[in-house]
Amino acid sequence: KKVVLGKKGDTVELTCTASQKKSIQFHWKNSNQIKILGNQGSFLTKGPSKLNDRADSRRSLWDQGNFPLIIKNLKIEDSDTYICEVEDQKEEVQLLVFGLTANSDTHLLQGQSLTLTLESPPGSSPSVQCRSPRGKNIQGGKTLSVSQLELQDSGTWTCTVLQNQKKVEFKIDIVVLAFQKASSIVYKKEGEQVEFSFPLAFTVEKLTGSGELWWQAERASSSKSWITFDLKNKEVSVKRVTQDPKLQMGKKLPLHLTLPQALPQYAGSGNLTLALEAKTGKLHQEVNLVVMRATQLQKNLTCEVWGPTSPKLMLSLKLENKEAKVSKREKAVWVLNPEAGMWQCLLSDSGQVLLESNIKVLPTWSTPVQP
């Protein structure tokens, strides 16, 4: 008996060929001997089967001895043995229809679980193997689960169902809802404008939800909410914003915040959360602000940084085009009685400059100038 695998919702063509290349009488029946379709002379006739409105043939090939049964919009319950009766012969085809669905939404938050459920006909014993977009293989029976979804799991999952040495392939598009970056650091000189961007790693037709940025300043004992906002169909509207600092927010995606001035009291780290409509859980992105200040007071040239710096970062003070006068893995360095000239304060990581502030030291009879 020939076995044909089909997919729920798909189309299948079961072939039946006569040895005579001409239009002769044929019938397709199911295992209960209920007629599905056949011919009467040159016309198609249909029986009382449940396939009635979804079953057809290919009238144009009857005169070549081809009498297919074409079933559209397959259902699991269409799984059956179909019998083609032609020329006193019986051709049997076993049709097995499978369905594979994500039993939750296909748009999932980072860290959530994905469960794929296989619908299969009674009596079948299929095996399923799925390959994620990043090439990870998972195997299972009627259900497959993947916990802790990551951003790289976004994309097309290809699942192969195996039954009777035959296979049928399913493709399921999964969207992992997350920010493009889990964390980011912005380095700024005191007084500069600060831009925070929170690009999403996905695109959807309509995006609705609400969000908030909580900020923990290095100098503060507790965190505070800097801004709350709503998102409606990708349009951003601010609900509430603190007076200090007076943040501004872009009206369109990607989420974009502007801090008019980088000041030491703002240095620290924030957590932007975004709750999406009809989704449990929230998206998170951490953002950090490091602020640098270079000052000269009397005979002391000081360079300081505030905010979350890693212990391996180097802070240096050097006169332009000269070797560093002072270089430490600390958050403040200074030079006593600096000589006149353009001094550079540098924050660097393994030789790569992250932040630079210049201060001009005038001869001792003048006052310092900060460019």
Partner: antibody, heavy 118, light 107 residues
Framework: QVQLVQSGAEVKKPGASVKVSCKAS????????FSWVRQAPGQGLEWMGI????????SYAQKFQGRVTMTRDTSTSTVYMELSSLRSEDTAVYYC???????????WGQGTTVTVSS | DIQMTQSPSSLSASVGDRVTITCQAS??????LNWYQQKPGKAPKLLIY???SLETGVPSRFSGSGSGTDFTLTISSLQPEDFATYYC?????????FGQGTKVEIK
């Protein structure tokens, strides 16, 4: 959900052959029949033939008999149409389409332009 | 071979108009008649199969009728996206044959 993607445009000399491919995705390739239809510039649609699912049996329009060969490769979910002894009148856009019998051709490829010129 | 003749070969109409295209088969083809829409540079799209059944996803302003040798495609209220060429096709016997097409243009 089923999509058909055809090979790129071809320029051929008279007497040569052309082989156009049509790759199916998003469905169960081995369960479908495919028709090939062509359309000369500014003209109507012309059916060339069909390749059936099981065993790849074919039926060609009399006009193309002897010049056309339709094949299928289940491993790559691809159907092919080869037309030989090309002449200038074969200049046309060639389409593959999933053929669901009495219900017509419900999914079409984007078309492949074949130009026959000396 | 079964000949399919469409009329008119072209027509001008305005948005909102009711448009009727006819297709005649050279012999009785029962209800084995399909209708397609084709826009310039694009592949045809199936609208109606077996003379009167609307293909999934096709707007209900399209309807088909007829049996035997005479068939009709009707667009009840023409929309801007409906300006295209329409083809009938018989699936009664091989070779499958198409009508020569009816071009629906903006008046």
């Amino acid at each position: 959900q089923v999509q058909l993607v055809q090979s790129g445009a071809e320029v051929k000399k008279p007497g040569a052959s052309v082989k156009v491919s049509c790759k199916a995705s998003g469905g169960t390739f081995s369960n479908y029949a495919f028709s090939w239809v062509r359309q000369a510039p500014g003209q109507g649609l012309e059916w060339m033939g069909i390749i059936n699912p099981s065993g790849g049996s074919t039926s060609y329009a009399q006009k193309f008999q002897g010049r056309v060969t339709m094949t299928r490769d289940t491993s790559t979910s691809t159907v092919y149409m080869e037309l030989s002894s090309l002449r200038s009148e074969d200049t046309a856009v060639y389409y593959c389409a999933r053929d669901v019998g009495d219900r017509g051709m419900d999914v079409w490829g984007q078309g492949t332009t074949v130009t026959v010129s000396s | 071979d079964i000949q399919m003749t469409q009329s008119p070969s072209s027509l001008s109409a305005s948005v909102g108009d009711r448009v009727t295209i006819t297709c005649q088969a050279s012999q009785d083809i029962s209800n084995y008649l399909n209708w397609y829409q084709q826009k310039p540079g694009k592949a045809p799209k199936l609208l109606i199969y077996k003379a009167s059944s609307l293909e999934t996803g096709v707007p209900s302003r399209f309807s088909g009728s007829g049996s035997g040798t005479d068939f009709t495609l009707t667009i009840s209220s023409l929309q801007p996206e409906d300006f295209a060429t329409y083809y009938c096709q018989q699936s009664f016997s091989s070779p499958l044959t198409f009508g020569q097409g009816t071009k629906v243009e903006i008046k």
